[in-house]
């Protein structure tokens, strides 16, 4: 089975760890795929190690473990993320995470200050 936090949040400009945990008494993990919606983020293979898709190579760091660290988050990164565990002999297992990227607290404070500033 796949165990993961279904919903997580992070601040714009910050980073977040995407993590799925696979547990099985018999099956061994051979490959893990990570996708942002329909877009491939990264792949881990027991044979080949990690490969981060070139589109994300400046923002995605493999790990910890079989998870991913997604950096320099933007509001556009809000959405569904999927981990797919390829196992032998167990088959394929999928997990889903919804990431909500929020405005940074600095931005929110700045916006509040701007809104309450007296008009000249």
């Amino acid at each position: 089975t796949i165990d993961t936090k279904r919903n997580i949040s992070a601040e714009e400009g910050g980073s977040v760890i995407l993590q799925c945990h696979f547990s099985s008494d018999t099956a061994e993990v051979t490959q893990v795929d990570w996708k942002q919606q329909d877009q491939l983020l990264a792949i881990y293979s027991v044979d080949l190690g990690w490969h981060v898709a070139s589109v994300f190579s400046d923002r995605v760091v493999p790990g910890p473990s079989l998870g991913l660290t997604f950096q320099s988050l933007t509001m556009n990164d809000t959405g569904e993320y999927f981990c797919t565990y390829h196992t032998y002999p167990g088959g394929i297992y999928k997990g889903r995470i919804f990431l909500k990227v929020q405005e940074s607290s600095d931005d929110r404070n700045g916006l509040a200050q701007f809104q309450t500033a007296p008009l000249g």
Epitope: K35, D38, Q39, L40, S45, D47, L48, H51, A53, V55
Partner: antibody
């Protein structure tokens, strides 16, 4: 530098057999899935077969299933394609190609021509 | 089997032109779509993998986009060495299947 070198092509009569080889160098051959892809003269690309790194999983196009057998010898860094019951429509350039993560074909050999004709 | 349909089958363009080739899958293939370039008498060369990721060493004038069933390969400014045939290929499921190819010729 990654290199893939096919050999074993040639002229064979319909119903005959041929074994193609692909010698790999410049990478850890035993870690990669490998594929055979062919191209008939003046035509497009057609995937033929693949084999996973440990030889545990193989797959074939319907057009060659039961006639062609893919295999590998990781100790020799070599991929093979045994082709039996050859038909005229098997005439093509046969390429071996490396398949990292099973999702794309990043390096290809130069190809070897198989001609099936009486 | 998943059918891959490329269009156009051929096109004529000039150096410096922006060129767009499309590929449509008969069912959703997520982002498991690759693009290859082939020159006469040579082996295919990987340009774009996973729909939009540029293969190492490939010039940045090549780009890919799309997901699901509709995909595009764009050459932002055609160079003399880009005249070739381009193929899309799905790796969502076996059998792996290729589009019929798009031949880019000199106008």
């Amino acid at each position: 530098e990654v290199q893939l070198l096919e050999s074993g092509g040639g002229l064979v009569q319909p119903g005959g057999s041929l074994r193609l080889s692909c010698a790999a160098s410049g990478f850890t051959f035993s870690s990669y899935s490998m594929n055979w892809v062919r191209q008939a003269p003046g035509k497009g690309l057609e995937w033929v077969a693949y084999i996973k790194s440990n030889s545990g999983t193989k797959g074939y196009a319907d057009s060659v299933k039961g006639r062609f057998t893919i295999s590998r010898d990781n100790s020799k860094n070599t991929l093979y394609l045994q082709m039996n019951s050859l038909r005229a429509e098997d005439t093509a350039v046969y390429y071996c190609a490396r398949g990292p993560y099973d999702y794309w074909l990043d390096y290809w050999g130069q190809g070897t021509l198989v001609t099936v004709s009486s | 089997d998943i059918q891959m349909t490329q269009s156009p089958s051929s096109l004529s363009a000039s150096v410096g032109d922006r060129v767009t080739i499309t590929c449509r899958a008969s069912q959703s293939i997520s982002s498991y779509l690759n693009w290859y370039q082939q020159k006469p008498g040579k082996a295919p060369k990987l340009l774009i993998y996973a729909a939009s990721s540029l293969q190492s060493g490939v010039p940045s004038r090549f780009s890919g986009s799309g997901s699901g069933t509709d995909f595009t390969l764009t050459i932002s400014s055609l160079q003399p060495e880009d005249f070739a045939t381009y193929y899309c290929q799905q790796s969502y499921s076996t059998p792996l299947t290729f589009g019929g190819g798009t031949k880019v010729e000199i106008k």
